[in-house]
């Protein structure tokens, strides 16, 4: 089954610094999202090989890419306190496939010592309702019907 390997699990950086998030898959993608999770999840970027990437206006001019959609490194620059959050890669294939998430902690420089990442990956409760790293049928189909549909190949 398709998987998304995402790293790092967590990173603590001072205001104004940069962070790299890497999303790796076994290939066969149509594209990949980086999304910031929360009550109103937000698309940060959509990357597709051979196409100019699309970036949310909040991050426009602050994001660089290297690699390909199968092994993509996203660099977010000039981080602000409001950028703190959990970011997850979503691979677009025939099913939904998620990375495990990256918790980015942006801190004032003087408070660096108070906010540190542990080595554990982000808690599952901080990620979307679907189990992380798993392949799921199209959730819109599932949510629109009284009974979840059987898993099927989607376009």
């Amino acid at each position: 089954a398709q998987e998304v390997q995402q790293s790092p699990h967590c990173t603590t950086v001072p205001v104004g610094a940069s962070v790299n998030i890497t999303c790796s898959t076994s290939g066969g993608l149509r594209g990949i999202y980086l999304r910031q999770l929360g009550p109103q999840p937000q698309d940060i970027i959509y990357y597709e090989d051979g196409v100019v990437p699309t970036t949310d206006r909040r991050f426009r001019g602050r994001i660089d890419f290297s690699g390909s959609q199968d092994n993509l490194t996203i660099t977010m620059h000039r981080l602000q306190l409001s950028d703190t959050g959990t970011y997850t890669c979503q691979a677009i294939t025939e099913v939904n496939v998620y990375g495990s998430g990256t918790l980015v902690l942006v801190t004032e420089e003087q408070s660096q010592g108070w906010h540190r990442c542990s080595d554990a990956p982000p808690r599952a409760s901080a990620l979307p309702a679907p189990p992380t790293g798993s392949a799921l049928p199209d959730p819109q189909t599932a949510s629109a019907l009284p009974d979840p549909p059987a898993a099927s190949a989607l376009p």
Epitope: R30, Y46, E48, V51, N96, A144, L154
Partner: nanobody, 116 residues
Framework: QVQLQESGGGLVQPGGSLRLSCAAS????????MGWYRQAPGKQRELVAT???????YYVDSVKGRFTISRDNAKKTVVLQMNNLEPEDAAVYYC??????????WGQGTQVTVSS
């Protein structure tokens, strides 16, 4: 406020054509993988065609070679051109974001009837 407005359905004979259109607003359309779904009476809603922000298209086997999906990011519209329609294509057609987990808004759909 998210809005999806489908139009263009109707009654057509087998072998005929229809052009469905969807106007979207309330989200960043240019970043969205968009899809056309359909639901026939008593059946599950199925995703029949998708188009990525970059314009790459994908189709379920049953419509390949007959349906064409396209998009206009400036106008925030997505179109499904349906040719050589078959009775099995009859359904209510909806457009929406595809492969999304945090999004559950639907338009009213547009009815496609294929009958002689």
């Amino acid at each position: 406020q998210v809005q999806l407005q489908e139009s263009g359905g109707g009654l057509v004979q087998p072998g005929g054509s229809l052009r469905l259109s969807c106007a979207a607003s309330g989200f960043t359309f240019s970043m969205a993988v968009m899809g056309w779904y359909r639901q026939a009476p008593g059946k599950q809603r199925e995703l029949v065609a998708t188009i990525t922000p970059g314009g790459n298209t994908y189709y379920v086997d049953s419509v390949k070679g007959r349906f064409t999906i396209s998009r206009d990011n400036a106008k925030k519209t997505v179109v499904l051109q349906m040719n050589n329609l078959e009775p099995e294509d009859a359904a209510v057609y909806y457009c929406n974001r595809a492969y999304d987990t945090h999004y559950d808004y639907w338009g009213q759909g547009t009815q496609v009837t294929v009958s002689s």
